[in-house]
């Protein structure tokens, strides 16, 4: 098999952090720097157990929506950029997302983008104001009162926050140490400079598969992975390892 000259050419997924109000559309852009003739572009959400769930895909010039039609992948006129959009985002859509590309034969390659975090904030309904007239301007004495009240409120809030932090930290010590991070916390990269793929490499699901219900995340997640491919991320270093068609079970969910 002819090995190509292939400089490191990663997918990008931006913005790295996106915040929207519930009900709004949330859009990330997945960028393929060099679009091949035949490819599949997948959009994933990372579950709390660090598993990837496919949301939607783009193949052969059309979108393949997932089970939830709110998730859409559309190709932009540039040909290299893809909009991955959540229509009418819900609070539980908050989490970690990424896109991945599978280059189909003959230049069979796998690329995965960096992760991006979506935060969907609750839409707070402002109570309607009774009159449209502007509020009366405060006198110097009134302003001082507002500052005083605000300071007290801030102090109380800080005290409550401190109490909550202590309450969260110390009971854990009495119950026994647990190395679990918060579920909402973005997944931290290890000390290694090279990105580690975390997509389940057990199979290539070219068709949609039924998602099995996920058991609750154990305190110490299992360390087993089917095959973790570590790609060098230095510019100019070779890209991902080419996959030969005969390499057995497909290593990436399509």
């Amino acid at each position: 098999l002819d090995s190509p000259y292939r400089p490191w050419s990663p997918l990008t997924f931006s913005p790295a952090q996106l915040t929207v109000l519930e009900g709004e559309n949330a859009t990330f852009v997945c960028h393929l720097p060099d679009v091949p003739e035949s490819f599949v572009l997948n959009w994933y959400r990372v579950s709390p157990r660090n598993q990837t769930d496919k949301l939607a895909a783009f193949q052969e010039n059309h979108t393949e929506p997932g089970k939830d039609r709110r998730f859409r992948v559309t190709r932009l006129p540039s040909g290299q950029d893809f909009h991955t959009t959540i229509l009418a985002a819900q609070l539980n859509d908050s989490g970690i997302y990424l896109c991945g590309a599978i280059y189909l034969p003959p230049n069979t390659q796998i690329y995965e983008s960096p992760r991006a975090e979506l935060t969907v904030k609750e839409r707070v309904l402002e109570p309607p104001t009774e009159s449209p007239s502007p509020p009366p301007r405060l006198t110097g004495q009134g302003q001082g009162l507002v500052v005083g009240v605000t300071s007290v409120l801030v102090g109380v809030l800080l005290l409550l926050l401190l109490t909550w932090v202590l309450a969260a930290a110390f009971p854990r010590a009495t119950r026994g140490a647990c190395a679990c991070g918060s579920e909402d916390e973005p997944l931290k990269e290890g000390p290694s400079a090279a990105p580690v793929f975390t997509v389940d490499y057990g199979e290539l699901d070219f068709q949609w598969r039924e998602k099995t219900p996920e058991p609750p995340a154990p305190c110490a997640p299992e360390q087993t992975e089917y095959a973790t491919i570590v790609f060098p991320s230095r510019p100019g270093s070779p890209g991902p390892l080419p996959l030969r068609p005969e390499d057995g079970p497909c290593p990436w969910p399509l």
Epitope: D2, R6, V35, P36, P106, N107, L204, F206
Partner: antibody, heavy 116, light 112 residues
Framework: EVQLVESGGDLVKPGGSLKLSCAAS????????MSWVRQNPDKRLEWVAT????????YYSDSVKGRFTISRDNAKNTLYLQMNSLKSEDTAMYYC?????????WGQGTLVTVSA | GVVITQDELSNPVTSGESVSISCRSS???????????LNWFLQRPGQSPQLLIY???TRASGVSDRFSGSGSGTDFTLEISRVKAEDVGVYYC?????????FGAGTKLELK
């Protein structure tokens, strides 16, 4: 209408060099990988080289690797094939094709003859 | 690389008849996505090759439905129904499962 027009073919001595060009029109050139395929006097087709849309990766057949270089200028909608250390077995009609493997469009070809 | 084998000549056919052209690959061209990575081209006399069929059975844009492709992972057939004079030429199959891309030697179709 997609059009690919090759030029630069000539009679050249063994060991010589030649640069072929392919002017593309009728499609968004920088969205497509491009390839060169040649047809020898026996009418056998041989894939020569492929270049991706953004020039990130190139592939060559073993018979030309190290001697031929495929390149492109997306601003000029042009594909090139620089051929060095030419051999008599490089004598062929050289076709420019759109695509990395599917080859949906071909030019009319340019003839390269390597002979003493 | 993958070796593609074709019969060089088909028996001359009469206009209006059907003809089958075969092609064999030294390894399976069926990929994990369920697609078979084989193309068919026709080169008419004095012309450049023209894509007829891609991914074993999908007709290229503008190609007559008289042309159809089929096969397994290693054995392939191009079927031409109701042959016309314009179908005369050399038919090539090509594998695109991996680089280097390889073509068969071609099968010449002639009319009686």
């Amino acid at each position: 209408e997609v059009q690919l027009v090759e030029s630069g073919g000539d009679l050249v001595k063994p060991g010589g060099s030649l640069k072929l060009s392919c002017a593309a029109s009728g499609f968004t050139f920088n969205n497509f990988g491009m390839s060169w395929v040649r047809q020898n006097p026996d009418k056998r087709l041989e894939w020569v080289a492929t270049l991706s849309s953004g020039s990130s990766y190139t592939y060559y057949s073993d018979s030309v690797k190290g001697r031929f270089t495929i390149s492109r200028d997306n601003a000029k909608n042009t594909l090139y094939l620089q051929m060095n250390s030419l051999k008599s077995e490089d004598t062929a009609m050289y076709y420019c094709t759109r695509g990395e493997s599917r080859f949906a469009y071909w030019g009319q070809g340019t003839l390269v003859t390597v002979s003493a | 690389g993958v070796v593609i084998t074709q019969d060089e000549l088909s028996n001359p056919v009469t206009s209006g008849e059907s003809v089958s052209i075969s092609c064999r690959s030294s390894k399976s061209l069926l990929y994990k996505d369920g697609k078979t990575y084989l193309n068919w081209f026709l080169q008419r006399p004095g012309q450049s090759p023209q894509l007829l069929i891609y991914l074993m059975s999908t007709r290229a844009s503008g190609v007559s439905d008289r042309f159809s492709g089929s096969g397994s992972g290693t054995d392939f057939t191009l079927e031409i129904s109701r042959v016309k004079a314009e179908d005369v030429g050399v038919y090539y199959c090509q594998q695109l499962i991996e680089y280097p891309l390889t073509f068969g030697a071609g099968t010449k179709l002639e009319l009686k």
